[in-house]
């Protein structure tokens, strides 16, 4: 069971001094989002017992394994259900505390009732302030039963629950009609999933026989020990004022555990600490009684005295729960209460005994949970004890459970049960994860989900080149850190597998599934340099470069050209995918921009050194498009174009350029310059008769501007085939070259 205790301080003279503390003895509990899992949660649960809203309660974390709830301002804040949740994953456990108002009309004789499946549970509500009206019983907040006030027996209202089953578990309450719910008696019923003394699926396994009021857990067969007791069977008392599964916690304050209620994981529930009883755990046990809630009776024999915390204290020469065993009777010594082994191992188990007559090898035996008896293979005889050594056959999962060492002599017999946990070595369920790669190294995250049992003590990473028959290389790594595999071959696939181990002999698990991780290519080392560049338009740039001559094949897949526009903080990248290329045309650039240009060789995803940078200034963009372009056929070989000058010119136009193309034709268009920029019309001559042409034009200042709209026009009639179109501006006689 999870080592989780919810402590309620019941010194109720002042609610502001009331506090609840949840203490976890689990390793690393409560540290929150780190590797150890979720934190401790402590809260009031208003789902069943609803109380009027008050100021929020204060939660304080004290170290990694303790959380305290304070800030109760009035007694009604205390009434209800509180829960603490701790442990990680499948071990996540909720501990519940139910608080009753000391001034309620009805009070529970006993708050927590733990019963076995099939038992009859009897809840008893004692009349504290009588009302002559019905009593309503509820289960988990819903109506359950009614009693007339005349049905009280000896000042108590009883609710009998025959043949209880696990779903009957929960919070029960008894309330007088017309009274505030805060005046109810609240109970907690815990129904174990099995009949008395049984546990496990199908309830086929036998409980270890929990002592001192411990309760056998119906899922794992472990004893949940009352506060103040420890051991597999709760056979050992803690020192006064201590609690926790290993007696590792100390009750706060000078009066020890007085006034504290302890709540433990189900099926234990809540009780006073060892040596105390009463509704507020403030009364010491009566003579002859001891333990949690003083429920145990000493019945000491042979001069033993009763200690209210630990039970019988035996005089010299006697031992046993009631001092009923003579020291001459053999006695098992210092047997560990719990042992852990890994699956399929063949451990040695030692069992030591003393007594008179002295135990010999044959008088000590070991019994497995299935009843198999093992005899010792050797014994070490010392003056004060005999230690028998047992060689255990290969362990299987069914060997988990309670083993028993038994010694028998003519003086009597003794036995000691201990728990053996057979753990399954961890096996990775997934392959390790590649984080980054270089040409000669891989960075790998080795920690993956796994089947079997933790904790993980070591992680081994096995790797070798893919399809290789050579031995695996192995590296042992810390479970929580990434690992770098070094001195690898470039551009090589490696098969990588994880192997996990848990503590103890035979803790190494099987190897996990392989994954293929490939190292990067070798880095390209050659540095190109820029031979030159020239502007082919306001947004076009042709670049050429060279590489140094070196022997051997070129290590590279292509080139990356980078243009940096410092003004806008933008980078343009152009990929040239041939390693033989030494020139590239860059288009779509921003006119009038100052660029920094460089070139790098690349190989796979790796970049070589960049060339020394060049600085390039593109000319600004040209003027806007001419407006209202119009075409008019004059003859079978002439078409006149008219237009209007562009608007918002940034400077004087140096010329116009006319583009002529036969409609639907496949050839390249012809460009004709109009060098008289003041003109707004021109005649295109030398055209073919009866042919449809497309025209558009643009102006130039320092650079060419935007194209105008395209216009269509057909030449007239049928004439001779012309040599090709030429142009004539108005008031200009000479033709222009195409």
């Amino acid at each position: 069971a999870v080592d989780l205790t919810l402590l309620a301080n019941l010194r109720l003279t002042d609610p502001q001094r009331f506090f609840l503390t949840c203490v976890s003895g689990e390793a690393g509990a409560g540290r929150g989002s780190d590797a150890w899992g979720p934190p401790l949660l402590l809260e009031k649960d208003d789902r069943i017992v609803r109380t009027p809203p008050g100021p929020p309660l204060r939660l304080a974390r004290n170290g990694s394994h303790q959380v305290t709830l304070r800030g109760f301002s009035k007694p009604s804040d205390l009434v209800g259900v509180f829960s603490c949740v701790g442990g990680a994953g499948a071990r996540r456990t909720r501990v519940i505390y139910v608080h009753n108002s000391p001034g309620a009309h009805l009070l529970p004789d006993k708050v927590t009732h733990t019963v076995n499946k099939g038992d009859t549970a009897v809840l008893s509500a004692r009349v504290h302030k009588e009302k002559q009206t019905d009593v309503i019983w509820k289960s988990n907040g819903s109506y359950f039963y009614t009693l007339d006030w005349h049905e009280a027996q000896d000042g108590r209202f009883l609710l009998q629950l025959p043949n209880v089953q696990p779903p009957s578990s929960g919070i029960y309450s008894a309330t007088y009609l017309e009274a505030s719910p805060l005046g109810s008696a609240f109970f907690r019923l815990i129904v174990r999933g099995c009949g008395a003394g049984r546990w496990g699926p199908g309830c086929t396994k036998e409980c270890p026989g929990c002592l001192h009021g411990g309760v056998c857990h119906d899922h794992d067969g472990e004893c949940v020990c009352p506060p103040g007791f420890t051991g597999t069977r709760c056979e050992q008392a803690c020192r006064e004022g201590r609690f926790g599964q290993s007696c590792q916690e100390q009750c706060p304050g000078i009066s020890g555990c007085r006034g504290l209620t302890f709540c433990l994981p189900d099926p234990y529930g809540c009780s006073c600490g060892s040596g105390w009883r009463g509704s507020q755990c403030q009364e010491a046990c009566a003579p002859g009684h001891f333990g949690a809630d003083c429920r145990l009776q000493c019945q000491c024999q042979n001069g033993g005295t009763c200690d209210r915390f630990s039970g019988c204290v035996c005089p010299s020469g006697w031992h046993g729960v009631h001092c009923e065993k003579s020291d001459r009777i053999p006695q098992i010594l210092n047997m560990a209460s719990e042992l852990e082994f890994n699956l399929e191992t063949m451990p040695r188990i030692n069992c030591a005994a003393a007594g008179n007559p002295f135990p010999v090898r044959g008088s000590i035996e070991l019994r497995k949970p299935d009843g198999t008896v093992l005899l010792s293979t050797k014994a070490i005889v010392e003056p004060e004890k005999t230690t028998a050594e047992f060689e255990v056959p290969r362990l299987v999962l069914a060997d988990s459970g309670f083993w028993e060492c038994r010694v028998s002599t003519s003086g009597g017999q003794d036995s000691r049960r201990f728990k053996v946990n057979v753990k399954v070595p961890p096996v990775p369920l997934a392959a390790p994860r590649l984080l980054t790669k270089q040409s000669r190294q891989l960075v790998v995250s080795p920690l993956v989900s796994f089947s079997g049992d933790g904790p993980i003590s070591t992680v081994r990473l096995h790797y070798r080149p893919q399809d290789s028959t050579m031995d695996w290389s192995t590296i042992v790594v810390d479970p929580s850190e990434n690992v770098t595999l070094m001195n690898l071959r470039p551009k090589t696939g490696y098969s990588v597998r994880v192997q996990l181990s848990r503590p103890g002999e035979g803790g190494e698990g099987a190897w996990g599934p392989p994954t293929l991780m490939t190292t990067d290519c070798p880095e390209p080392l050659l540095q190109p340099w820029l031979e030159g560049w020239h502007v082919e338009g306001t947004d076009r740039l042709r670049v050429s470069w060279s590489l140094p001559l070196v022997p051997g094949p070129l290590v590279g897949d292509g080139f990356l050209l980078r243009l940096w526009d410092g003004t806008r903080g933008q980078e343009r990248r152009e990929n040239v995918s041939s390693p033989q290329a030494r020139t590239a045309l860059l288009t779509g650039l921003t006119p009038g921009t100052h660029y920094q240009l460089d070139v790098q060789l690349y190989h796979c995803t790796l970049l070589g050194p960049a060339s020394p940078p060049a600085h390039v200034l593109l000319p600004p963009s040209g003027p806007p498009a001419p407006r209202h372009l119009h075409a008019q056929a004059l003859s079978d070989s002439e078409i006149q174009l008219t237009w209007k000058h562009p608007e918002a010119l940034p400077g004087p136009i140096s010329k116009y350029v006319v583009e002529v193309q036969v409609a639907g034709g496949a050839g390249d268009p012809l460009w004709i310059d109009v060098d008289r920029p003041e003109e707004t019309s021109t005649i295109i001559r030398g055209l073919n008769a009866s042919t449809r042409y497309l025209f558009r034009m643009r102006a130039s200042i320092q650079g060419l501007g935007d194209w105008s709209n395209t216009v269509e026009e057909s030449t007239l009639g049928n004439g001779l085939q012309a040599e090709g179109p030429v142009q004539e501006s108005r008031a200009a006689e000479e033709g222009l070259d195409q």
Partner: antibody
Framework: EVQLLESGGGLVQPGGSLRLSCAAS????????MSWVRQAPGKGLEWVSS????????KYADSVKGRFTISRDNSKNTLYLQMNSLRAEDTAVYYC????????????????????WGQGTLVTVSS | DIQMTQSPGTLSLSPGERATLSCRAS???????LAWYQQKPGQAPRLLIY???SRATGIPDRFSGSGSGTDFTLTISRLEPEDFAVYYC?????????FGQG
């Protein structure tokens, strides 16, 4: 679905006896308090008797005390009303009803109410 | 015994109007013990309100209850045709029920 079905009504002479039954289904009969309520022709409702779940406690209206007996058989999910020494003023439709208890608010006291009723059975006392 | 008196004996209203029904106890009644029922001709009564002001399951929110001590009120905010019926108030005390005359 909760259902209450009364039976056993009929015509009886003054001074005679009659036993009414109420068969319950659709709920756990054995945990609920049950009541009989009657309604004389053209008149209002009058509570007659109640019985607690265990059957050990019963309550009666003054007008029927000593003449009527309420009982229940939890194994048969049935409520009974044994009516003796019947009078003309006992003529009425007799309803059986389930008593439920509600949380009137999250934090307030519990409130009772007759949440399910049968369709009633007519008892006529006449010579 | 506590007597419950309802008024008015008859309330003549039209659909869409607001209805206010009054119930007075001969001595103080705990609010949690006051309930209202509706009965239509030829049918069994139906629980409307418990604890003086809480609507029973399935009761439309046009029905509301209020009051404390000796004076209690059932209000139907906007009458629907199916709301025309006889209404009874009821108190529970000393393990006995008392109804108003309707």
């Amino acid at each position: 679905e909760v259902q209450l079905l009364e039976s056993g009504g009929g015509l009886v002479q003054p001074g005679g006896s009659l036993r009414l039954s109420c068969a319950a289904s659709g709920f756990t009969f054995s945990i609920y308090k049950m009541s009989w309520v009657r309604q004389a022709p053209g008149k209002g409702l009058e509570w007659v008797s109640s019985i607690y779940p265990s059957g050990g406690q019963t309550k009666y209206a003054d007008s029927v005390k000593g003449r009527f007996t309420i009982s229940r058989d939890n194994s048969k999910n049935t409520l009974y009303l044994q009516m003796n020494s019947l009078r003309a003023e006992d003529t009425a439709v007799y309803y059986c009803a389930r008593v439920n208890y509600y949380d009137s608010s999250g934090y307030g006291p519990i409130a009772p109410g007759l949440d399910y009723w049968g369709q009633g059975t007519l008892v006529t006392v006449s010579s | 015994d506590i007597q419950m008196t309802q008024s008015p004996g008859t309330l003549s209203l039209s659909p869409g109007e607001r209805a206010t029904l009054s119930c007075r106890a001969s001595q103080s009644v705990s609010s949690s013990y006051l309930a209202w029922y509706q009965q239509k001709p030829g049918q069994a009564p139906r629980l409307l309100i418990y604890g003086a002001s809480s609507r029973a399951t399935g009761i439309p929110d046009r029905f509301s209850g209020s009051g404390s001590g000796t004076d209690f009120t059932l209000t139907i905010s906007r009458l629907e045709p199916e709301d025309f019926a006889v209404y009874y108030c009821q108190q529970y005390g000393s393990s006995r029920w008392t109804f108003g005359q309707g």
